[in-house]
Interface confidence: medium
């Protein structure tokens, strides 16, 4: 685990006025073990809309490290390996739940938070706006 | 508040042996308001690796309904609108955190759970295995 200097203003778990607060067991159960997923680890290079992965770290958040996808090109890679600007590489975004320490530095007190992350990229036909 | 028929086996929040349990404020904070995402709701139709969304419901989980992406084709859609089987549509998967009531029906006790969801699909060049 990680040791964090405890904020003296950390809420008391027995405080009945603490806003809609529940006990959450952080021994994460992983439901994915049976599915044995083929990790999509190389898709970011093999895709016609390839992406790079950027590390986003925040020690006040759980999980503290999140990898963000950034599309490499505006267009998509064609059969010749060139970028075709008649198509668009776009990020597939996803909202995820994370836990944020609240107040900061409290080891046992969190708030549920929704953040938006880019998971990968896909190649789409552009929307063409015709000017009258 | 909410009234739930309480499971007599619900853990005691004061129990010091309760496994790595923290207090979590469940009033979800939305970090996305600054970015105001343009929801990529039509990418699933416009992508060269289009996908359908399938409903997965579990009332003991939050979020209770998760729509999973399933790629429509093995191949990818080419410029003529036909499926090109020289390329592959593959799902982009992401592990997300969800909350599960544990034990079931306990209003103040949850477990954090990691599940693998398919967020969308991308078009990749296949890996060709040459037989010696």
């Amino acid at each position: 685990g990680i040791t964090i200097p405890r904020n003296p203003g950390c809420p008391n778990s027995e405080d009945k006025n603490f806003p809609r607060t529940v006990m959450v067991n952080l021994n994460i159960h992983n439901r994915n073990t049976n599915t044995n997923p083929k990790r999509s680890s190389d898709y970011y290079n093999r895709s016609t809309s390839p992406w790079n992965l950027h590390r986003n770290e925040d020690p006040e958040r759980y999980p503290s490290v999140i990898w963000e996808a950034k599309c490499r090109h505006l267009g998509c890679i064609n059969a010749d390996g060139n970028v075709d600007y008649h198509m668009n590489s776009v990020p597939i975004q996803q909202e995820i739940l994370v836990l944020r320490r609240e107040p900061p530095h409290c080891p046992n007190s969190f708030r549920l938070e929704k953040i938006l992350v880019s998971v990968g990229c896909t190649c789409v036909t552009p929307i063409v706006h015709h000017v009258a | 508040g909410i009234t739930i028929p309480r499971n007599p086996g619900c853990p005691n929040s004061e129990d010091k042996n309760f496994p790595r349990t923290v207090m979590v404020n469940l009033n979800i904070h939305n970090r996305n308001t600054n970015t105001n995402p343009k929801r990529s709701s039509d990418y699933y139709n416009r992508s060269t690796s289009p996908w359908n969304l399938h409903r997965n419901e579990d009332p003991e989980r939050y979020p209770s309904v998760i729509w999973e992406a399933k790629c429509r084709h093995l191949g990818c859609i080419n410029a003529d609108g036909n499926v090109d089987y020289h390329m592959n549509s593959v799902p982009i998967q992401q592990e997300i955190l969800v909350l599960r009531r544990e034990p079931p029906h306990c209003p103040n006790s949850f477990r954090l759970e990691k599940i693998l969801v398919s967020v969308g699909c991308t078009c990749v060049t296949p890996i060709v295995h040459h037989v010696a």
Epitope: - | N27, D42, L53, Y62, V65, I66, N108
Partner: antibody, heavy 126, light 107 residues
């Protein structure tokens, strides 16, 4: 399909409290949230607050904070809206509305009203 | 709070005509805008979610577009049963807010 059936019309005096029920049937009560929206005579729609039963969390519009309490009872699949300190300005039709708890195409689709109760007419008069 | 302003307030339309109702938000709300129809003495009914997503069971003549601050609800080929008041609703930030409504009646 989810059906929301609300309690009957009420006539109240200023200063009294009001408690309206919204009974849900069809679908799992825990798989969605309930919001309350009111409509004064000849006026538009006004959101008062909502609850997410699985999380037990409620959110209220600032205007009603301290005066409104939204609760839910999973055993009877019923949501309640209690409003205290009534004045004639609270004369309105009160609606409960279902809010999905969906994670759709990468987003939490938990913020629109896809099914509505029939409405409860509340008259506040001395 | 986010203010939604609809225009027009009132529209009198001939059947089969195209109806356009606009909704302008006081700040960027992405695509978290929804449209409802309310007929006299009835509860509101969801028509469009997230600016442009259609709802199962809603006739295809109803469509939505826009993002950011400017949104449009279009009824392509108005029918007599479409008379009522139409509301836009934003859910980007609390409190949820609604437009003042646009009343559509049939000539």
């Amino acid at each position: 399909e989810v059906q929301l059936v609300q309690s009957g019309a009420e006539v109240k005096k200023p200063g009294e409290s009001l408690k309206i029920s919204c009974k849900a049937s069809g679908g799992s009560f825990r798989s969605y949230g309930i919001s309350w929206v009111r409509q004064a005579p000849g006026q538009g729609l006004e959101w008062m607050g909502g609850i997410t039963p699985i999380l037990g969390t409620a959110n209220y519009a600032q205007k009603f904070q301290g005066r409104v309490t939204i609760t839910a009872d999973e055993s009877t699949t019923t949501a309640y809206m209690e409003l205290s300190g009534l004045t004639s300005d609270d004369t309105a039709v009160y609606y409960c509305a279902r809010v999905p708890n969906d994670f759709w195409n990468g987003y939490f689709a938990t913020d629109y009203f896809d099914d509505w109760g029939q409405g409860t007419t509340v008259t506040v008069s001395s | 709070e986010i203010v939604l302003t609809q225009s027009p307030d009132f529209q009198s339309v001939t059947p089969k005509e195209k109806v356009t109702i606009t909704c302008r938000a006081s700040q960027d709300i992405g695509s978290a805008l929804h449209w409802y129809q309310q007929k006299p003495d009835q509860s509101p009914k969801l028509l469009i979610k997230y600016a442009s997503q259609s709802i199962s069971g809603v006739p295809s003549r109803f469509s939505g577009s826009g993002s950011g601050t400017d949104f449009t609800l279009t009824i392509n080929g108005l029918e007599a049963e479409d008379a009522g008041t139409y509301y836009c609703h934003q859910s980007t930030s609390l409190p949820h807010t609604f437009g003042q409504g646009t009343k559509v009646d049939i000539k």
